[in-house]
Interface confidence: low
Amino acid sequence: GIMIPQSPGCPKTEDKNFPQHVRVNLNILNRSTPARRPSDYSKRFTSPWTLQRNEDPERYSSVIWEAKCSHSGCINAEGKEDHHMNSVPIQQEILVLRREPRHCPNSFRLEKVMVTVGCTCVTPIVRHIS
Amino acid sequence: GIMIPQSPGCPKTEDKNFPQHVRVNLNILNRSTPARRPSDYSKRFTSPWTLQRNEDPERYSSVIWEAKCSHSGCINAEGKEDHHMNSVPIQQEILVLRREPRHCPNSFRLEKVMVTVGCTCVTPIVRHIS
């Protein structure tokens, strides 16, 4: 995208808006190192999942990939589903920017969204009946 | 705390900063539903993990919890580590706000950070030697 030189000073703190409203530079700093792609593992997960595209043009990031566990049980070493084990989602709360007011191109609000990142396998709760 | 009223209109688009710089309301919209707490499952994971606190006051969220797989193998139904299986991290790229310039209380930049959310179990790659 277009790079715009940044003023060395701070933006003016407008009386009515500071500190609730701040200025954010959308030119993303990317300090993350590439993760091992799920495709490297995906056929070998004991609790596999599929990824569903969740798109919302009023939000940044506009596309979020949501994991959905493929089975209720877990896949054993023979590749069969073991119903004595359970696939469960791993969820994380992430920050997104929600356009607000909706029609404004340059005004957003922070929003917390719960996303499912993947699935993992758990042993079931065993209740002994006395 | 003190709430500051929001202007119903859009902020002025300053030529030199728009569209790279936008205004963000930090009063978080929280539409997410509480996740099932890891503690509900943590003793039953086949690929358990511990959480490490990563704190940075220059960042929002200032505290990020990083998962670290507890074992290289996976825990079987008997509670023993099975070295024929592997615990692997599930990573996700998240957005955070980084204060920039550093000294400004009201100016931030979006940053992408890779975090490990949890661990899952995979069957190892089996290479047949012919």
């Epitope: 500190p19 609730q20 | 705390g1 003190i2 709430m3 930090l26 009063n27 978080i28 006051p57 220059e58 960042r59 929002y60 200032s62 706000l97 204060r99 550093r102 000294h103 209380p105 931030f108």
Partner: nanobody, 119 residues
Framework: EVQLVESGGGLVQPGGSLRLSCAAS????????MYWVRQAPGKGLEWVAS????????YYVDSVKGRFTISRDNAKKSLFLQMNSLRAEDTAVYYC????????????WGQGTLVTVSS
């Protein structure tokens, strides 16, 4: 529990001086950038000055540059604002604030100290 207690405000004539102090407790003071923020009567908040964790750099809003000096004493967990050549427009409640991004609703701000500049 995080606590910030400001003192040193008062009534002063235009051109006069005041030194504001802020006593901090309940957190590792030396790990945080600190701010002075003010709220004039009937107005919102204005960031006045900030200082780096080790005191190596200071920053000021244009309207106070050359007149105000921010400083800190990490050993005593204290923040200061030396205000010289005071003007009527400096009349406000002055708050010290811990350099965390959120929460921004003054959970970690003091009760403030009132500075009145009037002849």
């Amino acid at each position: 529990e995080v606590q910030l207690v400001e003192s040193g405000g008062g009534l002063v004539q235009p051109g006069g001086s005041l030194r504001l102090s802020c006593a901090a407790s309940g957190f590792t003071f030396s790990s945080y950038r600190m701010y002075w923020v003010r709220q004039a009567p009937g107005k919102g908040l204005e960031w006045v000055a900030s200082i780096e964790q080790d005191g190596s750099e200071e920053y000021y809003v244009d309207s106070v540059k050359g007149r105000f000096t921010i400083s800190r004493d990490n050993a005593k967990k204290s923040l200061f604002l030396q205000m010289n050549s005071l003007r009527a427009e400096d009349t406000a409640v002055y708050y010290c604030a811990k350099g965390e991004i959120l929460p921004l609703y003054f959970d970690y701000w003091g009760q403030g100290t009132l500075v009145t500049v009037s002849s």
